[in-house]
């Protein structure tokens, strides 16, 4: 029950996280700056990964895409790539985890298969979350190092004079959405990995001394049953018969000419 809950919660948390990563990637408010203020209008500029927008206090807003724009920071392409990789991995992880959910039965899928799928999706969520956190952090670092506070010979706006002013980029809402979403996806992935441990049937072969029948090279191992953890329905307990095979820690059970006293 605890495993099912952990797996289900991990799935839901990752789902919310990936939705957040998608939202952050699409948002325009990755960085913001006030262009100018005056009694008539205040102009606010904000940029995303794909387009830049201008909003005025009158309510007028216009956005323009970067499609053909040259001279964009190279880091922007890296951030785009990280976010897209995060989304793709997260989406695949979600798809895999749906089939891995213990509460969903698909044919005669064994618990070991579900455990493997849970682990795979968990790892995918972890990598997805890390990609999102890395992407947002790279962008934030780009703002701080290159654009955080710059002196520009800039037009101070309507009603203003031409003078050198301090202009500053600030972190937009998308950065915080991305950090939180990446963190959630990461946590969800960890929960899936924890759930995987509970799903996997621990197979322990009890070892015993092998008894050799005269003239035959067949070892019979009593107690060679698969022990179940109780999480799986291990009804296929089999005795193990293997031709002369011994366990690694087994010593030779009959003397040979190489024995030393």
């Amino acid at each position: 029950m605890a495993v099912t809950a952990c797996q289900g919660l991990g799935f839901v948390v990752s789902l919310i996280g990936i939705a957040g990563i998608i939202a952050a990637t699409c948002m325009d408010q990755w960085s913001t700056q006030d262009l100018y203020n005056n009694p008539v209008t205040a102009v606010f500029n904000y940029q995303g990964l794909w387009r830049s927008c201008v909003r005025e206090s009158s309510g007028f807003t216009e956005c323009r895409g970067y499609f053909t724009l040259l001279g964009l920071p190279a880091m922007l392409q890296a951030v785009r790539a990280l976010m897209i990789v995060g989304i793709v991995l997260g989406a695949i992880g979600l798809l895999v985890s749906i089939f891995a959910l213990k509460c969903i039965r698909i044919g005669s899928m064994e618990d070991s298969a579900k455990a493997n799928m849970t682990l795979t999706s968990g790892i995918m969520f972890i990598v997805s979350g890390l990609c999102a956190i890395a992407g947002v952090s790279v962008f934030a670092n780009m703002l701080v190092t290159n654009f955080w506070m710059s002196t520009a010979n800039m037009y101070t706006g309507m009603g203003g004079m031409v003078q050198t002013v301090q202009t500053r980029y600030t972190f937009g809402a998308a950065l915080f959405v991305g950090w939180v979403a990446g963190g959630l996806t990461l946590i969800g992935g960890v929960m899936m990995c924890i759930a995987c441990r509970g799903l996997a049937p621990e197979e322990t072969n009890y070892k015993a001394v092998s008894y050799h029948a005269s003239g035959h090279s067949v070892a019979y191992k009593p107690g060679g049953f698969k022990a179940s953890t109780g999480f799986g329905s291990n009804t296929k307990n089999k005795k193990i018969y293997d031709g002369g095979a011994r366990t690694e820690d087994e010593v030779q059970s009959y003397p040979s000419k190489h024995d030393y006293v």
Partner: nanobody
């Protein structure tokens, strides 16, 4: 590079009218504000009129009611209709455009070469 080309200046009698036009061309991303400044000999450059992308306008107190600014966002042009001109309006008029390319703090300011307006009494 971005070029601003002004036209419409000249000599006019006091009380007369003139229309100044300015067209921006080149590697423009999204011009945020366009306007007109003027500089009389021996004086500082001052803002005459300004219009934002959304159509919000600003006028210097000395020209309110006499001058009208208009713009075409798609063509990146701005015009200044000057009526009831006075001798004190005599100056070199400069077109100004403020572009907001992404990740350029404060955006970029561009200026025209200027056009002379002379109002005779």
């Amino acid at each position: 590079a971005v070029q601003l080309v002004e036209s419409g200046g000249g000599l006019v009698q006091a009380g007369g009218s003139l229309r100044l036009s300015c067209a921006a061309s080149g590697s423009i991303f999204m011009i945020n504000a366009m306007g007109w400044y003027r500089q009389a000999p021996g004086k500082q450059r001052e803002l005459v009129a300004d219009i934002s992308r959304g159509g919000s306008t600003y006028y210097a107190d000395s020209v309110k009611g006499r001058f009208t600014i208009s713009r075409d966002n798609d063509k990146n042009t701005v015009s200044l209709q000057m009526n009831s001109l006075k001798p004190e309006d005599t100056a070199a008029y400069y077109c100004h455009a403020h572009d907001v390319p992404p990740f350029v703090p404060g955006g970029k300011s561009y200026w025209g070469q200027g056009t002379q307006v002379t109002v005779s009494s």
